[in-house]
């Protein structure tokens, strides 16, 4: 893959801009500078100046003021003012507001429920495989393997609490040491951030909305990945998390506490348990190498059971295997002993849709995965639509000001920390960081919350989920209390360490810059969002997993060159932007590389070819399909409901649209049009919410 998505001639001057680059770029443009931009070394070089901070539009004329795509959109209120309404209008307006609020809460409820069912679906599809990841003995010696197992398992079961509880039970039963568990917890932290990234994909319809939503979601990913990148080697070298948490656990004489309060689950469980109920113990049993569990179904059939303890006679290889010498005898052929067995008597079946279908877990999981994604997408569209109609004019201004404005000087720096606390508190209330960050994603998309404000909220969410884990640990039975508490504290201190690394100093807020960079790339090449998801959450972890299984030598043999190349590219990139003069002429830009290695354009062409079949029949039978359609084929006209793409060739012929001055754009999402992907007249036919 390219070192940077779009690398034209690297500028000798570090203050100039690169289109689509995810590198460090000043936020305020220097209009006196110019930059060369080419996609091909042979192509004539056009002197252009790029828009401020990541804009993908190329402009020839001296620009008048152009909006930064990261600026929040102004939500115009086209309705009649309150004061101008008559009594009947006011009453109607009031009830409309109440109706909207009820609808909003309703869709929000089903949105959260669909997230829960999505998690169940993932567990049904990949839960057993996830459990088997844990039974790999190399975890003990290889922290990198532990990390990727944490990522993969959490991605597969869509729940960090499930993977964490498996780790806790494995530590409690001495199958895993706390030292070996820490990388898995770090991986679980990464894995849990996939949920809101999936939610962000649902907002693919509107480019500007998608840019913000995807960046807002991936800021969580980047925070977690960067934290691990720094803290995993530190932990391996110093074991500071293990030591600190051990000291805390040993210094307190904990008594078993109460269970963490299930505040949101109380509301959602009555509905979700009618859809499906899972026996989560099965995944844990598989992780603990229980052979019988491999054939068990995750779908819970019996909800009311009676457990009867009884003693049975069992044969043993020798008297040494007897439960005790007093419970040991021979029948002349075999040695026998008495074992306590728990006999489970099924009394009442569970009340959910799949209870009598007896379908395999994969089938149930697939059905639920599709349905939950459809509901998730539908609810998200409706939430965005309702919020869009509510948050207009004055209301939007007030909300945006309240959420995004800092405290007055000299307390401005405190705002972010308050946001961290709010994020932690909200996550504690909803008992899930996935739910909180997923609910945040559409708000970032529609422009209610800035990424700069979403970032501390997300960090707070990371803390909130660990406090829930600490409470849950305190409620553990005696034998599991110490291990579960230590693991929960490791999780807590890992997130605290991450915040200390990537938040207090504005300069270190790298996740924001990286997320914005990715947001820009994904807004231009929407397929890249899916590509990013697959690469970071599946391919990289699976590759590391595979290499780890092959042994340390193979892992180091492949890993060291890869890491070396990445570091080399980063150093070169840094030198190109900061002090290019120290580099030889050839290395001052990326033109020495073939186009496919420095630009996403050729890859875009390949993806377009593959999705050509979708482009030609890009029908939108439903508004939900529209999202998938836009994501797959980047079709400009596909989202007029029940209409298909008309004359795509026309859109493709218009590839070389002349570059315009900013005043000719009638949409702030100018990047696509500026790149000549769609005629100007169609700039508003992007996938609208409804």
């Amino acid at each position: 893959m390219a070192p940077w998505p779009e690398l034209g001639d690297a500028q000798p001057n570090p203050d100039k801009y690169l289109e689509g680059a995810a590198g460090q770029q000043p936020t305020a443009p220097d209009k006196s500078k110019e930059t060369n931009k080419t996609d091909n070394t042979e192509a004539p070089v056009t002197k252009i100046e790029l828009l401020p901070s990541y804009s993908t539009a190329t402009l020839i004329d001296e620009p008048t003021e152009v909006d930064d795509p990261w600026n929040l959109p102004t939500l115009q209120d086209s309705g009649i003012k309150w004061s101008e309404r008559d009594t009947k209008g006011k009453i109607l307006c009031f009830f409309q507001g109440i109706g909207r609020l009820i609808l909003l809460l309703g869709f929000l409820y089903f949105f959260v429920c669909s997230l829960d069912i999505l998690s169940s679906a993932f567990q049904l599809v990949g839960g057993k495989m996830a459990g088997q990841f844990f039974s790999n003995s190399s975890i003990m010696s290889n922290p990198l393997l532990g990390l990727v197992i944490g990522v993969l398992v959490t991605v597969l079961v869509q729940s960090s609490s499930t993977s964490t509880s498996i780790v806790v039970s494995m530590v409690s039963s001495s199958l895993l040491t706390v030292r070996a568990a820490i990388p898995i917890i770090m991986g679980a932290n990464i894995g849990t951030s996939i949920t809101n990234t999936i939610v962000a994909l649902m907002q693919v319809g509107d480019r500007s909305e998608f840019r913000r939503a995807f960046a807002g979601a991936t800021v969580h990913d980047f925070f977690n990945w960067l934290s691990v990148l720094v803290l995993l080697p530190v932990e391996v070298a110093t074991h500071y998390l293990e030591i600190i948490t051990q000291l805390i656990v040993e210094s307190f004489h904990f008594k078993n506490g109460e269970d963490a309060p299930d505040l949101l689950k109380v509301i959602t469980k009555p509905f979700t348990k009618l859809i499906v109920q899972l026996d989560k113990k099965v995944i844990s049993q598989i992780a603990m190498n229980d052979e019988k569990a491999k054939n068990k179904s995750l779908v819970k059939i019996w909800c009311k059971t009676f457990t009867n303890k009884t003693q049975i006679n069992v044969t043993v290889p020798s008297t040494a295997n007897c439960t005790s010498p007093s419970l040991c005898w021979t029948d002349g052929i075999q040695n026998w002993t008495m074992k306590n067995v728990t006999y489970k008597e099924n009394i009442a079946k569970c009340q959910h849709i799949f209870v009598n279908f007896h379908l395999p877990d994969l089938a149930v999981g697939t059905i639920l995965l599709i349905l939950s994604l459809l509901v998730l997408c539908g609810c998200l569209i409706m939430i965005v639509k309702i919020l869009g109609s509510v948050l207009k004019g004055q209301v939007a201004t007030v909300i945006k000001k309240t959420i995004n404005t800092d405290f007055p000087f000299p307390f401005a720096w405190l705002t972010g920390y308050l946001a961290i606390l709010v994020g932690a508190g909200m996550t504690f209330i909803v008992q899930s960081s996935s739910v909180f960050t997923s609910a945040l994603t559409p708000l970032i998309g529609i422009g209610v919350i800035t990424i700069e404000r979403a970032y501390p909220l997300t960090l707070g969410s990371n803390i909130g989920t660990t406090t829930t884990a600490i409470l849950a640990a305190l409620a553990s039975p005696g034998n599991a209390l110490r291990s579960s508490l230590q693991i929960a504290l490791c999780h807590f201190f890992f997130n605290i360490s991450g915040i200390l690394l990537w938040y207090p100093i504005p300069f270190t807020r790298l996740p924001i810059r990286m997320a914005k960079g990715l947001g820009n790339i994904s807004a231009k090449y929407r397929w890249f969002a899916v590509f990013y998801l697959i690469i970071f959450f599946f391919l990289i972890p699976l590759t590391v997993f595979g290499l780890s299984l092959a042994g340390w030598r193979v892992l180091v043999g492949v890993g060291v060159p890869v890491v070396f190349i990445i570091i080399l590219v980063l150093c070169l990139r840094l030198l190109q932007s900061r002090c290019p003069r120290v580099l030889p002429k050839k290395l001052q830009n990326w033109n020495f590389l073939p186009l496919w290695m420095r630009s996403l354009k050729p890859w875009d062409a390949v993806v377009s070819k593959f999705t050509g079949c979708f482009q030609m029949r890009c029908c939108c039978c439903c508004r939900v399909c529209c999202r998938a359609c836009c994501l797959l084929c980047d079709c400009p006209k596909c989202c007029r409901c029940s209409k298909c793409c008309e004359d795509l060739e026309e859109a493709q012929e218009g590839q070389d649209v002349p570059v315009k001055a900013p005043e000719t754009f009638d949409n702030i999402t100018i990047s696509r049009e500026a790149q000549g992907e769609v005629p100007a007249s169609d700039s508003k036919t992007e996938c609208t919410a409804l």
Epitope: N313, T315, T319, P325, S326, L327, C328, W329, T330, D331, G332, I333, Q334, N335, W336
Partner: antibody, heavy 119, light 107 residues
Framework: QVQLVQSGAEVKKPGASVKMSCKAS????????VHWVRQAPGQGLEWIAA????????SYAQKFQGRATLTVDRSTSTAYMELSSLRSEDTAVYYC????????????WGQGTLVTVSS | DVQMTQSPSSLSASVGDRVTITCRAS??????LNWYQQKPGKAVKLLIY???RLQSGVPSRFSGSGSGTDYTLTISSLQPEDIATYYC?????????FGQGTKLEIK
């Protein structure tokens, strides 16, 4: 009713082999173990070996390992014991008995087969 | 192997007497002990299993007790038909071992 009918008395020379039978009736042959116990004249009982007709599992007392061979014929519900390399001290009454799997007792015994070893 | 020692090796008692036969194991057999009765010219019969449990069809005058290494068979009221040789057998440790027997006679 449960019956274990053993073959008749045998007189053997030292070094020879003897094969005795035990025909079972009145119960499911494969559900029980068949034990062989001997009693030398004026002596106590001595356990020799056992076999499970159901799965063919065998077990021998160390003393008889290699000399005693237990077999079963499920079609006729008959158990056999062959004792080789006979010595004069092998002169005894050989009993077959029925024992329930998992139980350390024999509840029904055969009438015994007298084996006399003399030159 | 576990050695089983019965005492006395023979005893005489009158009809109606309470008779006690003891059996000592060379090591703890954890109550895994049976008692058998062998009448002259008849098949051996199981009387008591697992120290104290009466086999079906056995008169209630027979009882067993004991633990560890010491066990007893008691006939509460001796009857003429009880004339026989009595054997104890342990089944805690492989192989099964029997006591040398106690011969009971009527005075």
């Amino acid at each position: 009713q449960v019956q274990l009918v053993q073959s008749g008395a045998e007189v053997k020379k030292p070094g020879a082999s003897v094969k005795m039978s035990c025909k079972a009736s009145g119960f499911t042959f494969t559900s029980y173990n068949v034990h062989w116990v001997r009693q030398a004249p004026g002596q106590g009982l001595e356990w020799i070996a056992a076999i499970s007709p159901g799965n063919g599992d065998l077990s021998y007392a160390q003393k008889f390992q290699g000399r005693a061979t237990l077999t079963v014929d499920r079609s006729t519900s008959t158990a056999y014991m062959e004792l080789s390399s006979l010595r004069s001290e092998d002169t005894a009454v050989y009993y077959c008995a029925r024992g329930r799997t998992g139980m350390g007792a024999v509840d029904y015994w055969g009438q015994g087969t007298l084996v006399t070893v003399s030159s | 192997d576990v050695q089983m020692t019965q005492s006395p090796s023979s005893l005489s008692a009158s009809v109606g007497d309470r008779v006690t036969i003891t059996c000592r194991a060379s090591q703890d057999v954890y109550s895994y002990l049976n008692w058998y009765q062998q009448k002259p010219g008849k098949a051996v019969k199981l009387l008591i299993y697992y120290t104290s449990r009466l086999q079906s069809g056995v008169p209630s005058r027979f009882s067993g007790s004991g633990s560890g290494t010491d066990y007893t068979l008691t006939i509460s009221s001796l009857q003429p038909e009880d004339i026989a040789t009595y054997y104890c057998q342990q089944y805690n440790i492989f192989p099964w071992t029997f006591g040398q027997g106690t011969k009971l006679e009527i005075k």
